[in-house]
């Protein structure tokens, strides 16, 4: 068999609300990946398992079951959404996301994922972790790779 | 606890300087915004100047720009407010303030600056 | 800039009864991320203004829940539903919104 790629191309949007009150911020994350058949027969994305991590806490989880079969030689786009929550230990952070007086409210997200593909009964996990900058200010949509974090190490926050 | 000192006050001539220093404790000091706010004799509040948690966002009252100057350095836990050619009118006790979405959450007791001949 | 406009002192109330204090604002305080930047602060006689409220009508930690505060875009409200001797000072509402941010002139809290 021939390698199945995944590619995870980035944060697509990211809509946020709070609870003013419990000073919580609530991130719906939608990303996006990219998956490659480059064998000569379909394989089934069985399903896809994600968590988002803020600052070595996970604040998110996510899993699509039964998402697709791609075809021989073939790709997709899979866009998918990961809940999170910035709460409890890291309020501090409510103060800072509703602060109006900084223009952009990027915080640096670990995004993680694993994708399950199977043919002919046999099973595969891809995983892949990408560090993102995400706007926890307002609602944004971004081009995809615009959120980037590009540096290499792992940020203080 | 946390507790915000302000200390550098004092009686100085216009024209003169002063640099006022904020020394906080009892939080993550470079996980929040800055600022100072000033009380004047006739007991009303101004807010002065503003400094961003790292220090990338900085904005002044339209009164003091180009007089005053605020700084932080994270890693002594300090706020700095260097004053320049100063006015009778910048008399007044001035407060360091823990900014953020949710208000001056924590204040300090304050440090006097008389602007006087 | 945004006028934040109080009247300097309230009507003077008794003690255990309530009290109201109100603040307008020359602009609407709320942002269309949901949340109304009206703060209110309490300074007590010869101490350091403290936060009584946050984002128009959320109550700051230790406040006691006698104060509430309500209001639009640009007309607000504090109210004290039993005002005891220690409420006595000077209430300042405050606009977070916009750069520079403004106070109103302050009301005092008159004990009759």
């Known amino acids: 068999p021939r390698s199945i790629d995944v590619k995870y191309i980035g944060v697509k949007s990211a809509y946020v609300s709070y609870d003013v009150q419990k000073r919580t911020i609530y991130l719906n994350i939608t990303n996006t990946l990219n998956i490659t058949n480059n064998n000569y027969y379909s394989v089934e994305v069985e399903n896809i398992t994600a968590q988002v991590q803020f600052s070595k806490t996970v604040i998110g989880k996510a899993r699509l079951n039964n998402i697709t079969i791609i075809g021989p030689l073939d790709m997709k786009q899979i866009d998918y959404t990961v809940p999170t929550v910035i709460a409890e230990e890291m309020s501090y952070m409510y103060d800072f996301c509703t602060l109006i007086s900084i223009k952009v409210h990027n915080i640096v997200l670990m995004m993680q994922v694993t994708v399950t593909t199977t043919y002919f009964g046999h099973s595969e996990q891809i995983s892949q972790e990408r560090y993102q900058y995400v706007d926890c200010g307002r609602n944004t949509t971004y081009q995809l790779g615009q959120s980037e974090y590009l540096n290499v190490l792992q940020p203080q926050q | 606890e946390v507790q915000l000192v302000e200390s550098g006050g004092g009686l100085v001539k216009p024209g003169g300087s002063l640099k006022l220093s904020c020394a906080a404790s009892g939080f993550t000091f470079s996980n929040y915004a800055m600022s100072w706010v000033r009380e004047t004799p006739e007991k009303r509040l101004e807010w002065v100047a503003f400094?961003?948690?790292?220090?990338?966002?900085?904005y002044y009252a339209d009164n003091v720009k180009d007089r005053f100057t605020i700084s932080r350095d994270n890693a002594k836990n300090n706020l700095y407010l260097q004053m320049r050619h100063l006015k009778s009118e910048d008399t007044a006790m001035y407060y360091c303030a823990r900014d953020g979405g949710t208000g001056f959450t924590y204040w300090g007791q304050g440090t006097l600056v008389t602007v006087s001949v | 800039d945004i006028v934040m406009t109080q009247a300097a002192f309230s009507n003077p109330v008794t003690l255990g009864t309530s009290a109201s204090i109100s603040c307008r604002s020359s602009k609407s305080l709320l942002h269309s991320n949901g949340i109304t930047y009206l703060f209110w602060y309490l300074q007590k006689p010869g101490q350091s203004p403290q936060l009584l409220i946050y984002q128009m009508s959320n109550l700051a930690s230790g406040v006691p829940d006698r104060f509430s505060s309500s209001g639009s875009g640009t007309d607000f409200t504090l109210r004290i539903s039993r005002v005891e001797a220690e409420d006595v000072g000077v209430y300042y509402c405050v606009q977070n919104l916009e750069l520079p941010y403004t106070f109103g002139g302050g009301t005092k809290l008159e004990i009759k």
């Open positions: 400094i961003s948690d790292g220090g990338g966002y900085i």
